[in-house]
């Protein structure tokens, strides 16, 4: 007789979790001497240890402190990127620009980018069917969880000027119930962190308005204000030609306005 | 080979501050982290604190949060621990070690903090 | 905080005996456990990490076992040099913490 198995709302865990992760360590490593003193099944035995064997509704950041202690790493703290909505462009961007750091640039980040992963109380399996979904089932699971801490841990960590990158093309460029909006801007510490500079990326190539005046991006700029933080905001009219002009700085087309 | 040595003996009199330093060698300072330890005379050993030097991070146990500060200056390969309104229930052998797996690895040889007025 | 308990607090042990010192965790604390040996007037030297895995240069007499709540540190054939206290301790979550220390005497 097949036992009863949680239905979830959302997708199951992503097919050959436990493998893609080692994997990924190992490359992670591999890519980074600096990280090359990282046992990976260590890291992989942590970040399993999170979730197996507890109900995917119940997991608390304290779950994820083996593994958050195992895959710290030293990250220039003045060359941080925050990004929401908008991961692909931030992505292309730290690739050209490789002297600064989004989250998925950093270990923990690349381990678990877009890969979803839960387990089932008091069983050693991994649930592939399905796993909690953040609105119709339950915040606490161990996806949200994780991102919720590895976020708080980025923040926590930027100093002087941090960047961000949204997305211009949304009806909330800030959206104070994205990761961006409700944890990494609450943990930027102002004692570190001088000022908050926000890039904001156009979609439309017609598209001239002043983004930076958006009520959201007003919001945006009166929350960190109150938290002792400077704030600033750049329209990126043209992300194609600002891509361009961070891979070539000496074009000619690159002293206009991008 | 790695390598923890610790400041000398100190005493310290109620209500002062001490200040413990730890210097490594023989691996990358900013890699790892450094725990905090120390044994009350006759004791068992009772977990501090820590440090990941090459990003700053910190985490204390709340039994000293308040007292105890740790710090480390990657200049020069060196950890500070520093606890604050000394009392005679402080008076321990402190030690730093290296966090190895969540374990401690490498461990200093220890500085006697005596309390007393 | 999580409580770590060993068994005994003491032993008595001749050279040559097999000696098995245990630790409990009050709650789950996966493989993350170290073992400790430590002398008098001497700072504690690391012989187990992740609950089973020998340090590097500890003699392979010193083993240790478990995964959970239950964990267990066995000496195969004691030797002089191993008369000492040994600690296990919990990095699963903060704080850290130790057992209260078993001391192995000679018999």
């Known amino acids: 007789v097949p036992r009863w198995r949680q239905q979830w709302s959302g997708p199951g865990t992503t097919k050959r979790f436990p493998e893609t992760v080692l994997a990924r360590c190992v490359k992670y490593t591999e890519i980074h001497p600096e990280m090359r003193h990282v046992d990976c099944q260590s890291v992989w035995d942590a970040f399993k240890g999170a979730f197996i064997s507890k109900h995917p509704c119940n997991i608390t950041e304290e779950d994820y402190q083996p593994l958050m202690k195992l895959g710290t790493q030293t990250v220039p703290c003045n060359k941080i990127l925050l990004w929401s909505r908008i991961k692909d462009l931030a992505h292309q961007f730290t690739q050209v620009q490789r002297d600064m750091f989004t989250l998925e640039d950093t270990l923990l980040g690349y381990l678990a980018d877009d890969l979803t992963w839960c387990g089932e109380f008091n069983t050693s399996k991994i649930n592939y069917q399905s796993c909690p979904d953040w609105r119709k089932d339950c915040s606490n699971n161990p996806v949200s969880v994780f991102w919720k801490t590895v976020s708080r841990r980025f923040a926590e960590a930027a100093c002087d000027v941090v960047h961000v990158m949204l997305n211009g093309s949304r009806s909330k460029i800030f959206d104070k119930n994205s990761t961006f909006g409700s944890v990494e801007v609450h943990n930027l510490q102002p004692e570190k962190v001088q000022t908050l500079e926000a890039w904001v990326i156009h979609g439309g190539r017609e598209d001239s308005r002043d983004l930076c005046q958006d009520p959201t991006i007003k919001e945006l700029e009166s929350i960190i204000s109150k938290r002792n933080i400077q704030f600033s905001c750049k329209n990126i009219y043209r992300p194609d030609k600002f891509l361009q002009c961070v891979k070539n700085p000496e074009d000619s087309s690159c002293t206009s306005e991008i | 080979q790695v390598q923890l040595v610790q400041s000398g003996a100190e005493v310290k009199k109620p209500g002062s501050s001490v200040k413990v330093s730890c210097k490594a060698s023989?691996?990358?300072?900013?890699?790892?982290?450094i725990e905090w330890v120390r044994q009350a005379p006759g004791q068992g050993l009772e977990w501090m604190g820590d440090i990941f030097p090459g990003g700053g991070y910190t985490d204390y146990n709340e039994k000293f949060k308040g007292r105890v500060t740790i710090t480390a200056d990657e200049s020069t390969s060196t950890a500070y621990m520093e606890l604050s309104s000394l009392r005679s229930e402080d008076t321990a052998v402190y030690y730093c070690?290296?966090?190895?797996?969540?374990?401690?690895?490498?461990w200093g040889q220890g500085t006697l903090v005596t309390v007393s007025s | 905080d999580i409580q770590m308990t060993q068994s005994p607090s003491s032993l008595s042990a001749s050279v040559g005996d097999r000696v098995t010192i245990t630790c409990g965790a009050s709650?789950?604390?996966?493989?993350?456990l170290g073992w400790y040996q430590q002398k008098p007037g001497k700072a504690p030297k690391l012989l187990i990490y992740?609950?089973?895995n020998l340090h590097t240069g500890v003699p392979s007499r010193f083993s240790g076992s478990g995964s959970g709540t239950d964990f267990t540190l066995t000496i195969s054939s004691l030797q002089p040099e191993d008369f000492a206290t040994y600690y296990c301790q919990q990095g699963q979550s903060y704080p850290y913490t130790f057992g209260q220390g078993t001391k192995v005497e000679i018999k």
């Open positions: 023989g691996y990358t300072f900013t890699n790892h982290w």
């Open positions: 070690a290296r966090g190895r797996d969540l374990a401690m690895d490498y």
């Open positions: 992740k609950a089973s």
């Open positions: 709650q789950n604390i996966n493989v993350w």
